[in-house]
């Protein structure tokens, strides 16, 4: 069996006074009662309609009636002021039955020929009201065959009389210190058969106010309190309402901090309901007063639960609590009206005792020891050694708390030794090798560990050297004995240095030539500068003008005499650059490789030979003088020479520095 | 949240320099507050070494003042504790906390010895 | 620097009574005053800071008084848990400095 709906069997048909279409007899009754199912209803109209008329269809008549309710008597062929024929009019039944019944009376003046009519069951639009009346649904009406349901608009249930709209209003919880709350609807009328809930839940500590606005319009009865529709409020105190009628309740300081709100509504009655505006208070804490130098932000009249301020210190003052600093403050008010941090301070900002120079001294500028917001202080380097580097050693004492130079520099100047000094003011004439006097070579640097070499003081601790005198020592850096601030070669006297790294040019390589024969030795500590330990300059990018041809320089050690011992006194020469072209020619014929001086390298050395660095020299500084700075600077890098030192014809070859300086200089930054 | 905790060798040698690291996670140490270093050596009390602050100044116990260097990595939210010269004395355990110990390190046991 | 003296250095107590703990400090600190408590082989435990001020989670029966130069803590009934030593802290100048603590010890 097909399933589906069980649709009614149709229910038509005809109707006709009896003779029909001829003329009816008198003194005649006939009663017909039709049904249709449930839902439905009949529906009758006239094809054919010929009766005696008569006053109020007293004599012959069709009268139409549903229950006990006359739809209409008919008579005549037309209607009249009191009487009324069917014309084209339908005629419907009230429920699902309908009673005609027809009568004729003792005699009709002349013949009349009745009526037809034809009526069908169809379905009753249950969700069509008259005017006036009472709509079906409370909101939506939704017809069907037989019948009709209702629904609701979201936010309502539908009741279990099918048909009332019952708001969900229950459940709704308000947190925030203030807010609204209302009837449903409102201010249009509330529902019906509604039981609402709300809850307002504060923190503890809070008290809600509750405050009734704009209009209070609830059913109430003159006789009894609220027994419609009412309003009432819970707290864990105590219980407010019922509320009904059209007065505006008064406001209920209810001294709690949760509070339900119940609104009962019935099956009658059309109201605009309620309003609700709730506010809440709490123990005030005591009002903050600023600390000395500081401000309070925000400033309210009062500060409660949960309220909170914070303080902002005067440019030049600091937080603090006791010693400890603060970057910000804030307290908050408790439930007990007490704050839950005590008032810091705003204190001076005090910069503290400035670091020690090295190398240098510290003056207080604004008064002894005045170390606070915007005391200042001069720093100075110890004079004729150390000079200041880029900073003119002024320092303030700024709102951060830091002493900070005038260029915004918070680290300390730094006290550069002053390079390239000596007792020797100018290079002398071409000599044979020279003793050295206190003074003269105070960046002539020892270095033993294996062999004897030389090194030149760079700053306060750096050592530049030939690669190939400390090749053997650059993983092994501790175990360069490094001694400066001496004359003699076995003094005790002397400063002690040690080796911290040892930086070897990438492009060295041992035993191939001495191309790139150039290394940095990091010290583990700076040394101190006097006058007998002095960092050697590096060449300016002008210095190639005192190296020309001829230019004199100055080779120092202990290397090698004419004798054939190592120096016991540190020794000098004094000898010219040789022409480069002249160099490479020396050194072209055996046994020397092709190729062996290159463009990194100089030459200095007289063509009759005798003035010459020799083994022991090795990494030590050939100096000139920078006569526009009065100031000594490494040309060269006691390097390699021809097997037999101070030969006729050949020459001392020294690395060249001038082309070092980007790595030098990348070197020293880097470590 | 908050929680600091300290590294660093527990054995050091008479006259090398003591280092620890704090680190300190949940919390910015540039945020706001005092960083301190703070020791207890066996049986004794507390003794404060020094802070940094949320914006990087140190303040140190003038009795340490000569040894102690107190720095920060921002980038790894960390500081740093180094007492150079260390002796026999500065066996300890090694704490480091927050402003004025609402959180603490759980402690590392430094001993000096050669 | 400001000396921090506790008294005393041990103290017997039942559990459920009361225990007075007392700080006093060489010079005024205010109320710059912290209050830790440590258990062997852990690292102090913050209870009180500002002399007062109890820090969140620290159970109500321990409380903080005192300005100037003398302090107390009181923990109003000792819990099984509360026996340890407990020191006081001043960080109103440098250097910060602690007491050298009060034992509580059960009765």
């Known amino acids: 069996t097909p399933l589906g709906p069980k649709w009614p069997e149709p229910v038509f048909g005809r109707l006709a006074s009896p003779g029909f279409p001829g003329e009816y007899a008198n003194d005649q009754e006939r009663r017909w009662t039709l049904t249709a199912p449930p839902g439905y209803r009949l529906r009758l109209y006239f094809t054919h309609f010929d009766l005696e008329l008569s006053h109020l269809c007293e004599y012959d008549f069709v009268k139409l009636s549903s229950g006990a309710k006359v739809l209409a008597t008919l008579c005549g062929q037309e209607s009249t002021d009191t009487e009324r024929a069917p014309g084209k009019d339908t005629f419907y039944s009230l429920g699902s039955s309908l009673d005609i019944t027809f009568r004729s009376d003792y005699s009709n003046e002349k013949p009349f020929t009745g009526f037809e009519a034809f009526y069908a069951a169809e379905d009753i639009d249950e969700c069509q009201v008259a005017p006036g009346e009472a709509p079906t649904c409370d909101h939506h009406c939704h017809n069907h065959l037989g019948g009709f349901y209702c629904s609701c608009r979201a936010g309502y249930v539908l009741h279990r009389n099918k048909r009332t709209c019952s708001a969900l209003c229950s459940g709704q919880v308000f947190t925030q210190r203030s807010g609204e709350l209302s009837s449903p609807e409102y201010p249009r009328p509330y529902p019906k058969l509604s039981s609402c809930t709300y809850s307002i839940s504060l923190e503890e500590g809070f008290s809600v106010i509750l405050d009734f606005v704009e209009s209070f319009d609830v059913e109430t009865h003159p006789e009894t309190l609220c027994p419609y529709d009412f309003l009432k409020i819970q707290t864990d105190r105590e219980e407010h309402g019922p509320f009904c009628g059209k007065t505006l309740p008064h406001r209920i300081e209810t001294k709690s901090n949760t509070v339900t709100i119940t609104f009962v509504t019935d099956e009658s009655g059309d109201h605009t309901g309620w309003k609700i505006h709730y506010t809440s208070t709490a123990q005030p804490c005591p009002y903050p007063m600023a600390p000395p130098n500081g401000h309070v932000s925000p400033v309210q009249a009062k500060y409660i639960l949960k309220d909170s301020f914070s303080i902002f210190c005067e440019t030049g003052y600091e937080l603090l609590q006791g010693h400890l600093p603060l970057k910000s403050f804030t307290a908050v008010c408790q439930k007990d009206g007490s704050w839950d941090r005590p008032m810091p301070a705003c204190s001076i900002v005090d910069c503290g005792p400035p670091d020690d120079l090295p190398s240098g001294r510290v003056e207080y500028i604004t008064g002894p020891g005045v170390t606070t917001y915007k005391a200042v202080i001069q720093y100075s380097c110890e004079e004729t050694f150390y000079t200041m580097k880029v900073n003119d050693g002024k320092y303030v004492c700024e709102a951060d708390g830091f002493w900070t130079s005038s260029k915004g520099e918070k680290s300390l100047p730094v006290c550069e030794p002053v390079c390239g000094l000596s007792a020797r003011t100018t290079g002398g004439q071409i000599y044979g090798g020279q003793k050295a006097k206190p003074g003269d070579f105070p960046w002539q640097v020892l270095i033993l560990g294996g062999t004897t070499a030389a090194g030149a003081l760079l700053y306060d601790n750096w050592v530049l050297t030939a690669a190939h005198a400390v090749y053997e020592q650059k993983h092994d850096a501790s175990a360069l004995d490094i001694r400066m601030g001496t004359l003699k070669r076995l003094s005790p006297h002397y400063t002690q240095a040690w080796s911290e790294a040892v930086f070897i040019h990438e492009g060295y390589t041992h035993d191939a030539g001495f191309d790139n024969d150039i290394a940095l030795i990091k010290l583990n500590n700076k040394v101190v500068i006097n006058s007998n330990i002095t960092p050697i300059c590096l060449p300016r990018k002008e210095a190639e003008s005192f190296m020309r041809t001829d230019d004199i320089g100055t080779a120092s050690g202990w290397g090698l005499t004419q004798r054939g011992f190592l120096a016991r006194n540190l020794m000098y020469v004094d000898i010219p650059i040789v022409d480069h072209q002249k160099c490479t020619a020396a050194y072209e014929k055996p046994p020397y490789p092709r190729g062996s001086v290159t463009a990194n390298m100089l030459c200095a050395g007289l063509e009759s030979g005798g003035k010459d660095s020799c083994r022991g020299d090795s990494g030590g500084a050939l100096v000139f003088l920078d006569s526009e700075t009065e100031r000594w600077f490494v040309g060269g890098i006691v390097s390699w020479g021809s097997m037999n030192c101070g030969e006729a014809g050949q020459y001392g070859v020294y690395t060249k520095v001038i082309n070092y300086i980007p790595w030098i200089e990348n070197i020293i930054s880097d470590f | 949240q908050v929680q600091l905790q300290e590294s660093g060798p527990g054995l050091v040698k008479p006259s090398e320099t003591l280092s620890l690291t704090c680190t300190v996670s949940?919390?910015?140490?540039?945020?706001?507050?005092?960083w301190n270093w703070i020791r207890q050596p066996p049986g004794k009390k507390l003794e404060w070494m020094g802070y940094i602050s949320y914006s990087g100044r140190t303040s140190y116990n003038p009795s340490l003042k000569s040894r102690i260097t107190i720095s920060r990595d921002t980038s790894k939210n960390q500081f740093s504790l180094k007492l150079s010269s260390v002796t026999a004395a500065d066996t300890a355990v090694y704490y480091c906390?927050?402003?004025?110990?609402?959180?603490w390190g759980q402690g590392t046991l430094v001993t000096v010895s050669s | 620097e400001i000396v921090m003296t506790q008294s005393p250095a041990t103290l017997s107590v039942s559990p459920g009574e009361r225990a007075t703990l007392s700080c006093k400090a060489s010079q005024n600190v205010g109320t710059n005053v912290a209050w830790y408590q440590q258990k062997p082989g852990q690292s102090p435990r913050a209870l009180i800071y500002s002399a007062s001020y109890r820090y969140s989670g620290i159970p109500a029966r321990f409380s903080g008084s005192g300005s100037g130069t003398e302090f107390t803590l009181t923990i109003s009934s000792l819990q099984s848990e509360d026996f340890a030593v407990y020191f006081c802290h001043q960080y109103n100048s440098n250097p910060l400095t602690f007491g050298g603590g009060t034992k509580v010890e059960i009765k």
């Open positions: 906390s927050r402003h004025y110990g609402d959180y």
């Open positions: 949940g919390y910015s140490i540039t945020s706001d507050y005092a």
